[in-house]
């Protein structure tokens, strides 16, 4: 006899895991056999779909490899033409392990600002997310939360934040890590320590110090007057974040000195000053102060000036009294830039015998100054026009510095030697006498205002000098 | 920071040359006099030779004057030392070092880390 | 040829003062010699400690100290420490003419007991 179709298995709900096979079974009595069709969420799922896999007369659908989009609810629908067409529903709940679809990724931030490692997961039931640093679970405090979404928001970051994260996506089936990502912490770069101002002696060695801070570690660079650090030596070391850098000076002239600590974040840099102030104390003092030592002199700028193996006056309020006096020399030379072929090697030899003034060794180490008649040569005779020159520029504040005031001499304030012979000395490249001056071109219109002294002539070369040095 | 790398040693025979390199960084190399010094293996300091910081004049110990050179190339920030006619009792370690000042003579306050200058056959 | 001449080795009691000596086998040092002293520990390079006859470099702790006594440049450690313990060297000018020379001592080996 014709029966109706009565469905005498209902559907149930499946739970299946993505990848595998999920089955539902409609089992059906009635005669004639009925027309078994499917439907996900109301809509009608086609025989030919290899995705599925009807048998028993359509009373077995078979999923075959469940995806997650898979969710939802299915019916079967049983008809033989006897009665009513008769239904049955079940749903699919696709159950998946966590899988994180959104891992976090390396970061750098600046210290200061809020940094959000994304950490989006996907699972059926919802996995819960966590986060580690390091090796151990990381503390949500008022700064340092875990998302909805899972991923992990840090306010006002800290270079303590910095480290190796990653997330953990947890549910019932089983867990999912990320890999590991680096926080890194980048802070501007800062001064710790400033250098400081010193006022200070010509000639004396000074460092400055300066310390700065940062990530990455800062380049600190020194300027001098605006410009880059032209001379000294630089020293820098650096140890646990924090560069120190020592620039070690000598003395010349007064000088604004500005370290400067920079890095780099990302294309953009950040940069911290300091300055310090060098001034010169007491310019005329070392000439006045008689504390020092004699010895043999062994630079070079006067090697072809003094007398061979001369015992010098080394003046101990230079903290370095022969580079002191060989700068003194050199600079000097330099600031008396035009000078003729007549007044060079004279000129020389003054400076030299001045600056390196001879030695009398004693219990008081005492220099000699030069000769009166032989500074006034040099000034009014062999570099008249110079040394006019060079006062006015004096006068008018022209000099880069006022080191040249210690390098030549006042001819009135020396002593002559006609008080004294053994308390001034000679220049010894100023061999001429009376006859050989005839020759030298008038440079004066003046008469010199003392009587140059009758020296013995001498055959070799009056004004060899070494041309490494010379004046122009 | 202040540096100086020496380079430029090795074995050499009797009667061979050698020249040694000194590079220098973190300070203003043509302000300051630069020395040569050795120490043979297991002796004490020998003075080479000196140079003041504008190359204008040179020094030498007596036992290597007309065989060894010193030159610098301040544009270079480098230092050398040509070797020639090299004896075994040149084996040592040949330092760089650094002047604290201009002139050639006086205390080194800089040294590299030395170059090892084996003379033998 | 003048030869520079130290005590072969010494040694001195950690807090302990010692001085170290530096003469000419020939004449005396003086001033002109511009004694400078420098130390060197083992498998390192040297390091000046004093220029100048008793100029101290910089960085040098102020236990170091030079001076000229008598006819021999001198070294004075005050107060000693386990880390001074190393070999020294003085060196000396010797200019004469245009002659110059720049000469070691052998160095002397210190020992902080």
């Known amino acids: 006899l014709p029966k109706a179709p009565v469905i005498t298995t209902p559907l149930e709900t499946v739970d299946a895991l993505v990848e595998e096979v999920a089955t539902f079974m409609c089992a059906v009595e009635s005669y004639p056999q009925p027309e078994i069709s499917w439907t996900r969420n109301k809509i009608l799922i086609k025989l030919f779909d290899t995705r599925y896999s009807i048998r028993e007369n359509g009373q077995l659908l078979t999923i075959l490899s469940v995806e997650d989009s898979d969710d939802g609810i299915y019916c079967c629908t049983a008809n033989n033409g006897v009665g009513g067409a008769v239904e049955s529903c079940g749903a699919l709940q696709v159950k998946m392990k966590p899988k994180i679809t959104r891992p976090p990724i390396n970061v750098k931030i600046i210290e200061g600002l809020k940094a959000v490692l994304p950490c989006t997961t996907m699972g059926n039931p919802k996995p819960s997310v966590s986060w580690i640093k390091g090796d151990s679970p990381l503390r949500e405090n008022s700064r340092i939360a875990v998302l909805e979404s899972g991923s992990l928001r840090i306010h006002n970051v800290q270079k303590e934040d910095a480290g190796q994260y990653r997330c953990v996506a947890k549910n019932s089936l089983g867990t999912a890590y990320s890999k590991v990502v680096k926080l890194e912490v980048e802070v501007f770069a800062r001064i710790l320590r400033a250098p400081e101002s010193h006022n200070v002696t010509f000639g004396s060695f000074v460092t400055l110090h300066c310390t700065a801070t940062g990530i990455p570690v800062p380049t600190i660079t020194w300027i001098e007057n605006g410009n880059a650090v032209s001379s000294g030596s630089i020293q820098e070391s650096v140890k646990d974040r924090v560069i120190d850098s020592r620039l070690q000076l000598f003395i010349t002239k007064p000088g604004l000195y500005t370290c400067i600590a920079t890095n780099k974040h990302g294309e953009k840099f950040s940069t911290a000053k300091a300055a310090a102030t060098i001034s010169i104390a007491e310019w005329s003092k070392p000439q006045k102060d008689n504390k020092g030592y004699c010895a043999q002199y062994r630079g070079e700028v006067c090697n072809a000036v003094l007398a061979k193996d001369a015992l010098v006056f080394l003046n101990t309020s230079y903290a370095d009294p022969e580079e002191a006096q060989e700068l003194l020399v050199h600079t000097a030379w330099n600031e008396l830039k035009v000078v003729s072929p007549v007044c060079r090697p004279a000129a020389e030899a003054l400076l030299c015998n001045h600056i390196f003034q001879e030695c009398s060794p004693g219990v008081v180490p005492t220099p000699i100054p030069i000769c009166r008649e032989y500074c006034l040569a040099v000034k009014e005779l062999f570099c008249a026009k110079e040394w006019l020159v060079m006062e006015e520029k004096t006068h008018r504040g022209l000099y880069r510095s006022e080191m040249h005031l210690l390098s030549v001499p006042e001819c009135s304030k020396l002593p002559s030697m006609h008080w004294d012979p053994t308390a001034c000395a000679r220049l010894p490249h100023l061999d001429y006498n009376k006859e050989n001056l005839k020759t030298f071109p008038p440079m004066t219109s003046s008469k010199p205002s003392v009587d140059i002294p009758n020296l013995p002539s001498s055959s070799s070369s009056s004004f060899s000098v070494s041309p490494t040095y010379s004046m122009t | 920071e202040l540096q100086l790398v020496e380079s430029g040693g090795g074995l050499v025979q009797p009667g061979g040359s050698l020249r040694l390199s000194c590079a220098a960084s973190?300070?203003?190399?043509?302000?300051?006099?630069m020395s040569w010094v050795r120490q043979a293996p297991g002796k004490g300091l020998e003075w080479v030779s000196a140079?003041?910081?504008?190359?204008?004049?040179?020094y030498y110990k007596e036992s290597v004057k007309g065989r060894f050179t010193i030159s610098r190339d301040n544009a270079k920030k480098t230092l050398y030392l040509q070797m020639n006619s090299l004896k075994s009792e040149d084996t040592a370690v040949y330092y760089c070092?650094?002047?604290?000042?201009?002139?050639?003579?006086?205390?080194?306050?800089?040294w590299g880390q030395g170059t090892l200058v084996t003379v033998s056959s | 040829q003048a030869v520079v001449t130290q005590e072969p080795s010494l040694s001195v009691s950690p807090g302990g003062t010692v001085t170290l000596t530096c003469g000419l086998s020939?004449?005396?040092?003086?001033?002109?010699?511009?004694p400078d002293w420098y130390q060197q520990t083992p498998g390192q390079a040297p390091r000046a400690l004093i220029y100048?006859?008793?100029s101290r470099h910089s960085g040098v702790p102020s236990r170091f100290s030079g001076s000229i006594s008598g006819n021999k440049a001198a070294l004075t450690i005050t107060g000693a420490q386990p880390e001074d313990e190393a070999d020294y060297y003085c060196a000396l000018y010797m200019g004469r003419g245009s002659n110059k020379d720049y000469v070691f001592g052998g160095g002397t080996k210190l020992t902080v007991l």
């Open positions: 020939s004449g005396s040092v003086t001033s002109s010699n511009y």
């Open positions: 140079i003041p910081w504008n190359g204008g004049s040179t």
């Open positions: 070092a650094k002047r604290s000042g201009r002139i050639a003579f006086g205390a080194l306050d800089a």
């Open positions: 973190g300070f203003t190399f043509d302000d300051y006099g």
């Open positions: 100048s006859t008793n």
